[in-house]
Each structure stands twice: as C-alpha cells, then as structure tokens.
C-alpha cells in the first residue's frame, strides 16, 4: 500500500510521471479519451496504475474538485453487492442507480452513479509515486 | 523520431515456436504501453497483445491466449513477442507498434516481419 | 467485439477529387475512432486520431468527422501520393477492432 511519510509536506518529495496529477500519497491520471468500464481498466494496468478506487469521502471531495458534470469510470462494480476493485465494499457513500443493468460504478462532481460498463465515458486512474510499489 | 524495427520472422513447421523481437529508439521505452498487431489477407488487421510500461501486465485477445505471451527489456529498449504451438492460421505480416499514451491505439508502427507458418 | 464495417471496400478516383469513406460501428464508440493509411510493403501510418484530430504532418486534406457509430473520412482534393488503403480502428472497447480496409485506386 501506499502509506508512510506524507508526501505534501516532506522535504524531497516522490514526483508522479508526465501527465499524472499528484495529490497527497497518490498519483492521479484524469482521461482526456473515453473507453467502456473494461478498457479503461486495462487502460490504468498498462500503465502500471490502477482504475480509481477511493478510500474514504475525503479522497472523494477531493477528487470531485477536478471533475465536471461528465461522468468518469472508477473502479467500482457491482457483483453481488457494489465493490472496489480492490475487494473492498462500497461503505462510505451512496451510488445511485436506474436500472439492474447498470453494473459499473462512475464518479462526477455531484457523486457516483452506476451505468451500463458498455458506456464509453472518460476515467481515472490511481497510483503510487514510487515505480515498485504495488497500490493493492 | 520513433522508430520501431522488427526481426525475427520467419518459416516454421505447425506445432514450432518463434520469438519475435522489436527494437524501439527515439523515445523513452520505459515510458510507453507496446503491442504487436498482425495482418492477413483474409483477416485484415488484428491486435495481438499489449504489455504495460513496466512489464508486470499484459492483455491479450482470447484466441491467442496460452499460445503467445508478449515481453519486454526497458533496459534494452526492447520487445518480444514469443509464439509456442504456431498453426496455419498466425501466418501473418507482424507489427511492433507503440501505444499512444493517452489511450488512442497506437501511434506508430514497425515496418512488420513475416511468419509463415507452414509444413 | 464491436464490428466495424468499412466502405466502400474498394474505389477509383481521379487526381483532384474529393473522396469520402465511411466506417460503422455496431455500437456506441463515441469519438475512439483513428484512421491509418497504408501503402503497399509499408506499415499503416496513424492519419486521423479521436475521429477528427490529425496527426503532425498529415496534410489539411484529410478530415475526419462523426461520433456514435457512424464515421467519415474525407480526403478534400486526392493527390497521387494519396492513392493506398485506408481502414478505421475503434480503441472505445478492448479488443481494438479495425475495419477491413478501403482500396483507393488511380481512375
């Protein structure tokens, strides 16, 4: 996991790579592109990251900050019950959801929404500063 | 400028094996998502595999999984392709190409090595 | 997989003409849509990303427009360096799918 100093504050701070955004422990890639649920996963893993699992509301608010009325793909399914990608389960907020088909998880400035995973939208990706730690 | 050169092809028996080999200049290796592509008369073109910056994934379609497993040495600026239980059907012109890094396919494109795979 | 269908598979123009391929989708790719054109011994080069942005060095001619699933590439005023085959590739949903090519012959 990506724990231990904070980074914000450190004297020599892990930089993240070329188009990635930094923010406290983490690395984040905000898409310009759009790619259905599946590809924007294999999006994040070719490149060494993962797509966005959040970790408590105040990551969350954070993020939102960066996002518009548009809709990005997180990493958030529901496969018996709303989970992380990570296999964590959906705890600290609510998704709202129209339809049973709507089996993957997005984000935007107002919250998450599930959509159909077919759906080309933008996405997120996280990762860590460091090249040889693993997020999960 | 970006340049990728293929080697490595070849004529080879149903049932063998083949590597391929790609070597990448003019851009920072380590810094970009690969693939190979190939292209048939009869299927046209058709991606193959893809191996992330690092190495430690790799995304392939499934009537080439088990049988080909893409690789790479960032130290060597290079990338494989390995083949194992070759049939008639991967006879193929083979492409090195880079992935475009904001997720747009690939960008640039090898010149191609042949594999003829045929008894 | 999505289908792509490309057409017309083959065509004869002229020198000066104005040419216009089509690509369908058999479902929504938005705007993940790149045309390449390649000539005969060579590699496919990228013309055309996000269905409408030329790459550097591709000459004004060459245009691209549509969104949804149904695509359109447009050369302006055909050159003789023009005459190849041009296919389309959706990158909206793995695996990447290419269209089966469109031949562009001299008159």
């Known amino acids: 996991l990506c724990q231990g100093s904070n980074y914000s504050t450190c004297a020599s701070c892990p930089s993240c790579p070329d188009r990635w955004m930094k923010y406290g422990n983490h690395c984040y890639y905000f898409s310009v592109e759009e790619k259905d649920w599946n590809s924007s996963l294999e999006f994040c893993l070719a490149r060494d990251s993962h797509l966005l699992v959040i970790t408590d509301n105040q990551e969350m608010s954070l993020l939102q900050v960066f996002l518009s009325e548009a809709f990005c793909w997180i990493g958030l399914r529901n496969n018996s019950g709303w989970r992380w990608e990570d296999g964590s389960p959906l705890n600290f907020s609510r998704i709202s959801s129209n339809s049973f088909v709507q089996t993957c998880g997005a984000i935007n400035k107002n919250g998450l929404q599930a959509s159909s995973c077919e759906v080309p939208l933008h996405w997120v990706c996280k990762k860590c500063p460091f090249a040889d730690q693993a997020l999960f | 400028q970006v340049q990728l050169v293929e080697s490595g092809g070849g004529l080879v028996k149903p049932g063998g094996s083949l590597r391929l080999s790609c070597a990448a200049s003019?851009?920072?290796?380590?810094?970009?998502?690969m693939s190979w592509i190939r292209q048939t008369p009869g299927k046209g073109l058709e991606w193959v595999a893809t191996?992330?910056?690092?190495?430690?994934?790799?995304n392939y379609p499934d009537n080439v999984k088990g049988r080909l497993t893409i690789s790479r040495d960032n130290a060597k600026n290079s990338l494989y392709l390995q083949m194992n239980s070759l049939k008639a059907e991967d006879t193929a012109v083979y492409y090195c190409?880079?992935?475009?890094?904001?997720?747009?396919?690939?960008?640039?494109w090898g010149q191609g090595t042949t594999v003829t795979v045929s008894s | 997989d999505i289908q792509m269908t490309q057409s017309p598979s083959s065509l004869s123009a002229s020198v000066g003409d104005r040419v216009t391929i089509t690509c369908r989708a058999s479902?929504?790719?938005?705007?993940?849509l790149n045309w390449y054109q390649q000539k005969p011994g060579g590699a496919p080069k990228r013309l055309i990303y996000?269905?409408?942005s030329l790459d550097s060095g591709v000459p004004k001619r060459f245009s691209g427009s549509g969104s949804g699933t149904d695509f359109t590439l447009t050369i302006s005023s055909l050159q003789s360096e023009d005459f190849a085959t041009y296919y389309c590739?959706?990158?909206?949903?793995?695996?990447?799918?290419f269209g089966q090519g469109t031949k562009v012959e001299i008159k």
């Open positions: 590739l959706q990158y909206a949903s793995s695996p990447w799918t």
């Open positions: 996000a269905t409408s």
């Open positions: 191996i992330s910056e690092s190495g430690n994934y790799n």
């Open positions: 190409v880079r992935d475009d890094w904001e997720g747009r396919a690939m960008d640039y």
């Open positions: 003019g851009f920072t290796f380590r810094n970009y998502a």
């Open positions: 479902r929504d790719i938005g705007s993940s």
